[in-house]
Interface confidence: medium
Amino acid sequence: TEETIKFAAAHYNTEILKSIDNEWRKTQCMPREVCIDVGKEFGVATNTFFKPPCVSVYRCGGCCNSEGLQCMNTSTSYLSKTLFEITVPLSQGPKPVTISFANHTSCRCMSKLDVYRQVHSIIRR
Amino acid sequence: TEETIKFAAAHYNTEILKSIDNEWRKTQCMPREVCIDVGKEFGVATNTFFKPPCVSVYRCGGCCNSEGLQCMNTSTSYLSKTLFEITVPLSQGPKPVTISFANHTSCRCMSKLDVYRQVHSIIRR
């Protein structure tokens, strides 16, 4: 289908092509600022809450050209963030805790097979 | 839990408290730029593809203070975007189509009951 778009381009308004190009650019696979629910990220006990409940980090997101590709991180850094942890029933007031969050620093569209290999090589390590 | 936070501030470095505040700010419920998969958004036929497969629009996202609240749009505009539509098997080349996408312009943390009411009032209309 990539080939056919080359031919299609020849007959369409430059304005249309520019706006389509812009959409590709904005939706490409790259690190994007997202809100992560702290409790869900770490699977904490249901009686433990965090304030704020979410943190802002970068994770790979966006779209790949093809159905068989997936937007995956190729490098990761870790960010330490301090939050209040509240345990119910309240035996003590909220205590500040410092938690490390994965922050994706680069991304790539990878075939689902490569993703599978990458995940399994990490597990084997 | 809000009450208990009154006592949390005691004796903590201002820096810790300010960084926690900054996290609240960055993760608040607000319109955020997201990538929308066009096919999934409109539930199109499996033999229809779009190039680019995704578009960038604003949708409400982020976190609310409480479990019972949900980040919901309170106002919406519609953006027209031109994409190439490709139908398989290729009876013709990619054709440009203009599609309207919901773009959230303001958001609010609403109780799940309010969300239910809002959705149902829209359905009744």
Epitope: K51, P52 | E2, I5, K6, A8, A9, A10, H11, Y12, N13, T14, L17, K18, S19, I20, D21, N22, W24, R25, Q28, N65
Partner: antibody
């Protein structure tokens, strides 16, 4: 333009209550810190407490803990100081002040209200 | 709580004089110190934040220095409008605390 305007001061009897308001404009109230500071006649500045309106936590000086409550209504961009069980020594001009933003290079009270006088006397 | 001790509590000076006010914290507060000027019947005004940074719109004759526990506010050449009371404040830990003030009077 950033502005803080206090209101609600006046004469009250010992043991009585009073609620002061601090109306804010010209900045993002929700993610600021709003402090209350008082000054007894002819004396220095005394920090009373603060609230982080968007986050919902507040903290108080020992001298007012349990008697004063700071709250905020983010829909009205207003902070409140509810003063109960007032004593003669609470007589002062009460100021609200904004703590400089997190993104700012340092923390200090960059904007203050004009102050409102609270007199506790029988 | 962190105590802030200011000295002197008052001083007399003439226009054009160099004036120095010191403030000592009861424990290390890094550079989280602010200085304010207050005139009778008015709200305080921020002069210096983070120990040494001049707040916008404040004349350059005002300067601040110090870190840890010892801090100084200096007015290089006193002007008629500078006669006022000056306060230091630590913003390192909650509760924030002020010094007791230094009154600068005309000699």
């Amino acid at each position: 333009e950033v502005q803080l305007v206090e209101s609600g001061g006046g004469l009250v009897q010992p043991g009585g209550s009073l609620r002061l308001s601090c109306a804010a404009s010209g900045f993002t109230f929700t993610y600021s810190w709003i402090h209350w500071v008082r000054q007894a006649p002819g004396k220095g500045l005394e920090w009373v407490g603060f609230i982080s309106p968007g986050v919902g936590y507040s903290y108080y000086a020992d001298s007012v803990k349990g008697r004063f409550t700071i709250s905020a209504d983010t829909s009205k961009n207003t902070a409140y100081l509810q003063m109960n069980s007032l004593r003669a020594e609470d007589t002062a001009v009460y100021y609200c002040a904004r703590d400089a933003d997190y993104d700012y290079a340092g923390w200090a009270f960059d904007y203050w209200g004009q102050g409102t006088l609270v007199t506790v006397s029988s | 709580d962190i105590q802030m001790t200011q000295s002197p509590s008052s001083l007399s000076a003439s226009v054009g004089d160099r004036v120095t006010i010191t403030c000592r914290a009861s424990q290390d507060v890094s550079t989280a110190v602010a200085w304010y000027q207050q005139k009778p019947g008015k709200a305080p005004k921020l002069l210096i934040y983070s120990a040494s940074f001049l707040y916008s719109g404040v004349p350059s004759r005002f300067s601040g220095s110090g870190s840890g526990t010892d801090f100084t506010l200096t007015i290089s050449s006193l002007q008629p409008e500078d006669f006022a009371t000056y306060y230091c404040q630590q913003t390192y830990r909650i509760p924030y605390t002020f010094g007791q003030g230094t009154k600068v009077e005309i000699k």
